[in-house]
Interface confidence: low
């Protein structure tokens, strides 16, 4: 806390300029009017203040706006944003995408911080949903942003926003998130032709149900093994050997290398060994010839 001291004669700041870098902390406190600072915040960034001096400037703004800064000030915070705590940011009402971009730019190249996370939360909650422009902005700065949202939060993403999503944006998504995103992607890309559709939908297929995988197997898509390994196990299990062969096309040979890993391992256990042998890959572990396969899940559902 800086003590209140009178401003020395002739030192009262008329504007925010470079002369202030020679002011001691107490002089900044005493000689810079908070209202002047608020109206000339855009100049602060161009002046090489020390961290200690920035602390004083923040303190002045905090006193002027105890309920939270107005957006006109927030937009021009620049490096002063790095001095804000999540508690400070929770008081803000940020509605302009330009403000969000300006602050994200300050943090560019750094890891996502609690301050930025709080800022984004405040912004998205204020908007009510993740529109395409917001999603474009956030994923440009933080490719992992989409996968940081809970399934409940993702449900507010409109299908139109899905066009902004790049494959790398989904790298850290887990199955529950893809369950929410996949139907939106299906809707967003529904008017595309076969091969173009597959290119777009491929990253979302970790949320696809069996029926959709069966449909894809009829379209010569040649799914790669990396995509296949990310499919839901429960969606893969009902696929026949012929369907998997069609789905993977020339990549079917890759099943051998993955035979001990899910979902391939569990799928093998559900297939007749005779059918697996038709692939000529030496896959082992299928149901031996002459064994009867009971669908216990159907029995459980009836009981």
């Amino acid at each position: 806390e800086v003590e209140k001291t009178a401003c020395p004669s002739g030192k009262k700041a008329r504007e925010i300029d470079e002369s202030l870098i020679f002011y001691k902390k107490w002089e900044l406190e005493a000689c810079v009017d908070a209202a002047l600072l608020a109206t000339q915040m855009d100049r602060v960034n161009a002046i090489p203040f020390t961290y200690e001096q920035l602390d004083v400037l923040k303190h002045k703004l905090d006193e002027l706006y105890p309920q939270g800064y107005p957006e006109s000030v927030i937009q021009h915070l620049g490096y002063l944003f790095l001095k804000m705590s999540p508690e400070d940011i929770r008081k803000w009402n940020v509605t302009s995408l330009e403000t969000l971009k300006a602050l994200l730019e300050v943090n560019k190249g750094h890891e996502m911080s609690p301050q930025v996370a709080t800022l984004i939360d405040r912004f998205v909650k204020g908007r009510g949903q993740l529109d395409k422009d917001t999603l474009d902005t956030l994923t440009a700065f933080y490719p992992g942003y989409l996968c940081s949202l809970s399934p409940e939060e993702l449900s507010s993403v409109p299908p139109s926003s899905i066009w902004a999503v790049r494959p790398q944006d989904l790298d850290t998504c887990d199955p529950r998130q893809l369950d929410v995103l996949y139907p939106k992607a299906r809707l967003a890309f529904q008017n595309m032709n076969g091969s173009e559709y597959f290119v777009k939908i491929q990253s979302f297929l970790g949320g696809a149900p069996t029926e959709d995988l069966k449909a894809l197997s009829q379209q010569n898509v040649s799914m790669d093994l990396a995509t296949f390994m990310k499919l839901r196990t429960d969606a893969v299990l009902p696929l026949t050997v012929a369907e998997v062969q069609k789905l993977l096309g020339p990549h079917v040979e890759g099943l051998k290398a993955e035979e001990r890993h899910r979902p391939v391992r569990d799928w093998i256990l559900r297939q007749r060994q005779d059918d697996l042998d038709t692939l000529g890959l030496g896959l082992q572990g299928g149901i031996p010839n002459g064994y009867l396969v009971l669908d216990l899940s159907m029995q459980e559902a009836l009981s």
């Epitope: 999540p86 911080s113 609690p114 709080t118 942003y145 940081s148 949202l149 850290t172 529950r176």
Partner: nanobody, 125 residues
Framework: QVRLVESGGGSVQAGGSLRVSCLVS????????VGWFRQAPGKEREGVAA????????YYADSVKGRFTIAQDYAKNMVYLQMNSLKPEDTAMYYC??????????????????WGQGTQVTVSS
């Protein structure tokens, strides 16, 4: 692949202190919960403490409140559990767990998708 690696642990006398650490790789660190769970022989795995990295909010089980402190070091991707005033009943395997899809945290085991291998903590009387 997301990995969580615990370190620390060991043996200590009742009333002593220990710190266990968790290195978190490839979590979406800024919206994740990282929690510490423990499992004593023959008992269910229970939640001990969790931290939400988005805001630094912390959560504790009643049995450890005031004795254990969870903290994060953002730059190093580390989460620490400082355990003071240890009791024999704190003896257990301690596991670090994480999830990248939360908007808040808790100590419900099913909410955590990623788990470490565990580190043993033994408190003798």
């Amino acid at each position: 692949q997301v990995r969580l690696v615990e370190s620390g642990g060991g043996s200590v006398q009742a009333g002593g202190s220990l710190r266990v650490s968790c290195l978190v790789s490839k979590l979406t660190a800024w919206r994740s919960c990282v929690g510490w769970f423990r499992q004593a022989p023959g008992k269910e795995r229970e939640g001990v403490a969790a931290i939400y990295s988005g805001t630094g909010s912390t959560y504790y089980a009643d049995s450890v409140k005031g004795r254990f402190t969870i903290a994060q070091d953002y730059a190093k991707n580390m989460v620490y559990l400082q355990m003071n005033s240890l009791k024999p009943e704190d003896t257990a395997m301690y596991y670090c767990a994480g999830t990248s899809i939360r908007s808040s945290c808790g100590l419900v085991r099913d909410e955590y998708a990623y788990w470490g291998q565990g580190t043993q903590v033994t408190v003798s009387s």
